[in-house]
């Protein structure tokens, strides 16, 4: 083995050593036909044209032409790993979900960490929320807890999601990231203040994936065996300790090792340093929800821990790297609507929107039978239903079982014990404007009570360092919002912007000219 190389760097060497006793496999086409020559195409004479009959070439080329699948529209860049969830505390009084059945119970899990806005080749060390999605393979089917590393989000109404993501991605003409788009949207939607403040704090750039917390973020509903329900939030706190990257280190790493997060996770697991997270819930009764000072289903708000303490449930442990990235990480599909009995959705509008959006995007990206892909398959449950056929149907298509319901032939029967919790709703049906549902109280508490003086200083510097590149009228809107949170918050950012704006040449076209370049003096003068 090469000296002092890490397991990720030595992956191929390790693969070879594992197979040392084996003879190399026979090279085949996709159909399994042995290949005699994989280095030369069939031609008429040494300089002649190709023959269509060269199926070794066409088989290879046609497959290569179709290798790429659409990247995820958000969370395109990610790392994955596998492990287990172990119950350490009894919460059966809240939930009948089999995953929580008894202390000591272990459930296999798959986890994917990701950034949000960047493409699949983008750097791991950018300032961006991180996805932290967990798939629990339970006996009652898969439970997908599609979380982030922040307990809140930028918006509370899902109709804004496409516009929000468009504002974070590339300008439709220039194809450049555009600070005007980013800050115009944020400044016009002050419900984003909470998440923006978290994002531009030290927590905005985690040191890899192992040193950050995870949150289900949404409010969910837990239902016990007696049909009694409570609202809940899920938290998973890193046992490795929170570590973040400085702006300088993050920038350096984005150049030197843009896959820093993937590498760090792979190497930790490969060397037996299995990362773990302690899993907690917060619980709110329906009565408490009625008197909660905010909408308890608002994704831009937190539930104060002082009022709704963290209740420990178990441990998430990651102890296996993917065997193949494409098969197990690129193709994994997390879907918040995958909830086994005992875990249900709350009226959280953003969660409700995701219940549709996630399986919809998977059907586009992976095909309508994406749940047949091994990593997505609920392999610890027996899938039996009336869904048939479709592209890439990979199992036995449920054989000769009836494909209609009801039927008289003993095909799968509904399970009354799996009925959803019933709840009474009444109210006006219309589009409710939530734009001004108290966008500042919790942000003020975060700024004043949670951050110390140094952290507040860095927060303002980080915001100003990004906001400076937006137009002045957008800067003013943003500063007005920060000032409403706290006068100091706005004034510190404004002071930094004033400094930047005084230094900034207006409408400059920045052109890099090599010293001693061959450009004529006249051309240089025109730059």
């Amino acid at each position: 083995m090469a000296d002092s190389r890490d397991p990720a760097s030595d992956q191929m060497q390790h693969w070879k050593e594992q197979r040392a006793a084996q003879k190399a496999d026979v090279l085949t086409t996709g159909a399994g036909n042995p290949v005699g020559d994989k280095l030369n195409v069939i031609t008429v004479g040494p300089r002649g044209p190709l023959l269509v009959q060269d199926v070794v070439f066409t088989d290879e080329m046609a497959h290569f032409d179709r290798e790429r699948i659409p990247e995820r529209v958000v969370h395109a860049k990610g790392a994955g790993a596998f492990g287990y969830f172990e119950v350490t505390h009894d919460i059966t009084k809240y939930s009948k979900a089999k995953v929580f059945e008894h202390i000591g119970k272990k459930t296999p899990i798959a986890v994917r960490f990701s950034t949000v806005a960047g493409e699949s080749g983008s750097a791991d060390t950018v300032r961006d929320p991180r996805g932290f999605a967990v798939k629990f393979y339970t006996e009652d089917g898969n439970w997908d807890l599609v979380g982030n590393n922040t307990p809140i989000f930028f918006i509370r109404d899902p109709i804004l999601f496409p516009s929000f993501i468009h504002s974070q991605k590339r300008n439709p003409q220039t194809h450049l990231k555009d600070p005007d788009m980013v800050w115009d949207f944020w400044s016009l939607r002050p419900e984003s203040l909470h998440q923006v403040s978290f994002l531009f704090s030290d927590r905005g750039i985690p040191d890899g994936h192992r040193h950050m917390n995870g949150y289900g973020s949404h409010t969910f509903k837990l239902v016990n065996a007696n049909g009694e329900a409570v609202y809940c939030k899920f938290h998973y706190k890193t046992d490795q300790g929170i570590k973040n990257l400085s702006v300088e280190d993050a920038a350096r790493l984005s150049q030197e090792d843009p896959d820093y997060g993937i590498r760090d996770l792979f190497n930790a697991i490969a060397t037996g340093k299995y990362p773990s997270w302690t899993f907690y819930i917060q619980v709110m009764t329906f009565n408490q929800a009625e008197t909660f000072p905010f909408n308890p289903f608002d994704l831009t708000k937190v539930w104060p821990h002082k009022d709704y303490p963290l209740i420990p449930v178990g441990k998430l442990v990651l102890n296996r790297n993917p065997v193949n990235y494409f098969a197990e990480v690129e193709q994994i599909a997390f879907d918040p609507s995958n909830m086994p009995p005992g875990i249900e959705a709350s009226p959280d509008k953003m969660l409700q929107g995701r219940l549709f959006a996630y399986p919809d995007t998977h059907r586009h990206r992976l095909g309508p039978n994406y749940l047949h892909i091994p990593v997505n398959c609920p392999y610890r449950a027996r899938v039996a239903n009336y869904q048939r056929d479709g592209p890439m149907c990979m199992q036995d298509n449920q054989g000769g079982a009836p494909n209609y319901y009801p039927n008289s032939f003993g095909a799968p029967e509904q399970q009354p014990s799996a009925l959803e919790h019933s709840i009474q709703y009444s109210g006006e049906v219309r589009r409710f404007n939530t734009a001004n549902d108290d966008n500042v109280t919790q942000v003020r508490a975060f700024y004043v009570n949670v951050l110390n003086e140094e952290q507040r200083k860095r927060l303002c510097e980080n915001i100003a360092g990004h906001l400076k590149d937006a137009q002045i009228f957008i800067q003013k809107k943003a500063v007005k919002n920060f000032t409403e949170v706290h006068p100091d918050y706005g004034s510190h950012i404004q002071a930094l912007l004033d400094k930047y704006n005084a230094e900034k040449p207006k409408n400059a076209i920045h052109t890099f000219v090599q010293s001693g370049s061959h450009l004529a003096a006249r051309e240089k003068a025109n730059l």
Epitope: P151, N213, I242, V283, K306, P309
Partner: nanobody
Framework: QVQLVESGGGLVQAGGSLRLSCAAS????????MGWFRQAPGKEREFVAT????????YYADSVKGRFTISRDNAKNTMYLQMNSLKPEDTAVYYC??????????WGQGTQVTVSS
């Protein structure tokens, strides 16, 4: 910064009682979630109990349920852990914890509880 100061630990015989206290600043006490954890020699730190600001909601580890009682006095910015019917397996360093909605966790220096048989 958040400062937590535990007291009340000591040596006690099996079946005996102790009352631990955790003092914090008013800002900490009114901002953070509060709870008790413990760490026995050679073991991981484990949850003991947690309490809401109003005292309405309390949660306990199964191993201490019915024997330990968590409480708080918001006027004194102090949280307590009344430990009755102590057992040798309760021997550990007991830590006060404050945690925020944003993942911050703060710990006191710990107070040693030793239960002899």
């Amino acid at each position: 910064q958040v400062q937590l100061v535990e007291s009340g630990g000591g040596l006690v015989q099996a079946g005996g009682s102790l009352r631990l206290s955790c003092a914090a600043s008013e800002r900490t006490f009114n901002t953070y979630g509060m709870g008790w954890f413990r760490q026995a020699p050679g073991k991981e730190r484990e949850f003991v109990a947690t309490i809401s600001w109003s005292g309405d909601s309390t949660y306990y580890a199964d191993s201490v349920k019915g024997r330990f009682t968590i409480s708080r006095d918001n006027a004194k910015n102090t949280m307590y852990l009344q430990m009755n019917s102590l057992k040798p397996e309760d021997t550990a360093v007991y830590y006060c914890n404050a945690n925020s909605e944003y993942g911050d966790s703060y710990w006191g220096q710990g107070t040693q509880v030793t239960v002899s048989s």
